[in-house]
Interface confidence: low
């Protein structure tokens, strides 16, 4: 399927609008500090060039690879060395090393200002004045802050963003219409970014085999009526799509994702009965819908797994002759029977099965050796079940904010070297598992909770990788993708940690806290809580609770005072002294 001009091929397949949007996303994800106007200029130049190639595929440079064309364009940026430092060295390399170099310099936590939402009228005016620029700015701002955001999905978010403004800027109460929609898009966007970041980490840190195993398990749960051959085909295609997007090949990724959605909808009879509604939607909505579709019903009367995977005399023969296909079949058969298990649990079971066969198929009596392999699964299944039960009970008892605080304390004691903003962000997200998953019935709790925790812990891993400070975090993040959560759960208080020096400045607050939103105020308090634990890692729950209650009362009192700033200064000193006494600092 070779094309004379790859850039012409993708332009024709995707259309000008999507082509331009995807090139903008690609450039913003690579050069995260570049001003918007510079990126727009580069995108327009690439688009004009692509059009010349569409007109004549034999025209000069049209035969060059997309990496060569895009890399050459990025390397024309005048301020590359000043803005990006050593990333400029990438431009001295040839493809494919140059693209790999750009990928390695993607920054998960770029030093960019927080996005502040303007007044609704200001946004509506900007939207009406220049809709195209307004929407491009959205793509640019999201892409540069989330350099691994799933590009075709970002097009779907942009479509919803446009729809929200189109509808709400005409509404009687613009704010009441628009703000909830923007909040929803923001929260969904953060979740989507984090989910995709795990897929890219899986591919880049653990390889294609790890990603394919994840995909076999998840698709088998989702499409339990599909045959193994069908699931295998979907896994192969899905792996290609995500490999491309994670590798910065956004045009190919979006094109292949559209092809995959088309294939799924043309073959839905042999995939799932739940796809009908998705397949009636336009392309971007269709792809999103398929990715989120509920699990199909399990076929009735599935035979016991033991027949093929334990009792059969062919187990070692089958395993030896085609290890990955046999293990893939095991994972497929186990996953389609267990929509109630998390994907990571299913992968742990498959790993245990693989390890057992590796050992037993070399033994004198293989069958005798692996006959009890399914018994080894019991503790692996019970561990997340018990953990979720305990944590959901704690969540129901405390509510989300205090549950987050319990996790903040727990994780700060485990890995106190990690930066306070990272501990706050990660623990707050870990705490959201309660409201997200504990409402579900038993059969849906584990896949919801443990697979969500995998996404959140990956955030910790990628942020920590940028500036590693804890051997324990490095160990849990790198040893095994599927055992990350059990690894972190098993960590006890770090006895080697030398408590942080007490710094009164850390606990000095001002009147500006009174004007913050409830969420931002919580973050301030949670930041103080992490700092407290770092100063006094041996502090008991009761001591910490007492100090936090005093702190909450202090903020409430001073925010009601006439002279707020004086109150914060004077009462703050008293609070610090009382806290030091209470904690023995």
């Amino acid at each position: 399927d070779a094309h004379k001009s790859e850039v012409a091929h993708r332009f024709k397949d995707l259309g000008e609008e999507n082509f331009k949007a995807l090139v903008l996303i690609a450039f913003a994800q690579y050069l995260q500090q570049c001003p918007f106007e510079d990126h727009v200029k580069l995108v327009n130049e690439v688009t004009e060039f692509a059009k010349t190639c569409v007109a004549d595929e034999s025209a000069e440079n049209c035969d060059k690879s997309l990496h060569t064309l895009f890399g050459d364009k990025l390397c024309t940026v005048a301020t590359l060395r000043e803005t990006y430092g050593e990333m400029a060295d990438c431009c001295a390399k040839q493809e494919p090393e140059r693209n790999e170099c750009f990928l390695q310099h993607k920054d998960d936590n770029p030093n960019l200002p927080r996005l502040v939402r303007p007044e609704v009228d200001v946004m509506c005016t900007a939207f009406h004045d220049n809709e195209e620029t307004f929407l491009k700015k959205y793509l640019y701002e999201i892409a540069r802050r989330h350099p691994y955001f799933y590009a075709p999905e970002l097009l779907f978010f942009a479509k919803r963003y446009k729809a929200a403004f189109t509808e709400c800027c005409q509404a009687a109460d613009k704010a009441a219409c628009l703000l909830p929609k923007l909040d929803e898009l923001r929260d969904e966007g953060k979740a989507s970014s984090a989910k995709q970041r795990l897929k890219c980490a899986s591919l880049q840190k653990f390889g294609e085999r790890a990603f394919k195993a994840w995909a076999v398990a998840r698709l088998s749960q989702r499409f339990p009526k599909a045959e193994f051959a069908e699931v295998s085909k979907l896994v192969t295609d899905l792996t290609k799509v995500h490999t491309e997007c994670c590798h910065g090949d956004l045009l190919e990724c979006a094109d292949d994702r559209a092809d995959l959605a088309k294939y799924i909808c043309e073959n839905q009879d042999s995939i799932s009965s739940k796809l009908k509604e998705c397949c009636e939607k336009p392309l971007l909505e269709k792809s999103h819908c398929i990715a989120e579709v509920e699990n199909d019903e399990m076929p009735a009367d599935l035979p016991s797994l033991a027949a093929d995977f334990v009792e059969s005399k062919d187990v070692c023969k089958n395993y030896a002759e085609a290890k990955d296909v046999f293990l893939g079949m095991f994972l497929y058969e186990y996953a389609r029977r267990h929509p109630d298990y998390s994907v990571v649990l299913l992968l742990r079971l498959a790993k245990t099965y693989e390890t057992t066969l590796e050992k037993c198929c070399a033994a004198a009596d293989p069958h005798e050796c692996y006959a009890k392999v399914f018994d080894e699964f019991k503790p692996l299944v019970e561990e997340p079940q018990n953990l979720i039960k305990q944590n959901c009970e704690l969540f129901e008892q405390l509510g989300e904010y205090k549950f987050q605080n319990a996790l903040l304390v727990r994780y700060t004691k485990k890995v106190p070297q990690v930066s306070t903003p990272t501990l706050v962000e990660v623990s707050r997200n870990l705490g959201k598992v309660g409201s997200k998953c504990c409402k579900h019935p038993e059969a849906k709790r584990m896949p919801c909770a443990e697979d969500y925790l995998s996404v959140v812990l990956n955030q910790l891993c990628v942020l920590h990788e940028k500036t590693p400070v804890s051997d324990r975090v490095t160990k849990c993040c790198t040893e095994s993708l599927v055992n990350r959560r059990p690894c972190f759960s098993a960590l006890e208080v770090d006895e080697t940690y030398v408590p942080k020096e007490f710094n009164a400045e850390t606990f000095t607050f001002h009147a500006d806290i009174c004007t913050l939103s409830e969420k931002e105020r919580q973050i301030k308090k949670q930041t103080a809580l992490v700092e407290l634990v770092k100063h006094k890692p041996k502090a008991t729950k009761e001591q910490l609770k007492a100090v936090m209650d005093d702190f909450a009362a202090f903020v409430e009192k001073c925010c009601k005072a006439d002279d707020k700033e004086t109150c914060f200064a004077e009462e703050g000193k008293k609070l610090v002294a009382a806290s030091q006494a209470a904690l023995g600092l």
């Epitope: 599909a226 009367d301 093929d308 085609a322």
Partner: nanobody, 115 residues
Framework: QVQLVESGGGLVQPGGSLRLSCAAS????????MSWVRQAPGKGPEWVSA????????RYTESVKGRFTISRDNAKKTLYLQMNSLKPEDTAVYYC????????GSQGTQVTVSS
């Protein structure tokens, strides 16, 4: 790429015979047990018969015992189902699958038993 392609279906009178074939590619055919599954109009898939990787151990659903015979040729990477004494209730789309799964895969081959 794992692929299974069935053939040999058709229209046959009650009491007649048909031989279905399933050509496999993309995996080590000789390493896996295989099955035939069928789906009658308006009904769910039903497991019909299975055979182990070497061809020695065969299993059948009660309604086809004594009438159907499953076999395989590992050298040709092909699975067979010989169907004798066919009845109208055998009318269905027949699929071959890997392992003892009762799910439908590929396109299947239509078998219609009618006078």
């Amino acid at each position: 790429q794992v692929q299974l392609v069935e053939s040999g279906g058709g229209l046959v009178q009650p009491g007649g015979s048909l031989r279905l074939s399933c050509a496999a590619s993309g995996f080590t055919f000789g390493s896996f047990g295989m099955s035939w599954v069928r789906q009658a109009p308006g009904k769910g898939p039903e497991w019909v018969s299975a055979i182990d990787s070497g061809g020695a151990d065969t299993r059948y659903t009660e309604s086809v015992k004594g009438r159907f015979t499953i076999s395989r040729d590992n050298a040709k990477k092909t699975l067979y189902l010989q169907m004798n004494s066919l009845k109208p209730e055998d009318t269905a789309v027949y699929y071959c699958t890997i392992g003892r799964s009762i799910s439908r895969g590929s396109q299947g081959t239509q078998v219609t038993v009618s006078s």
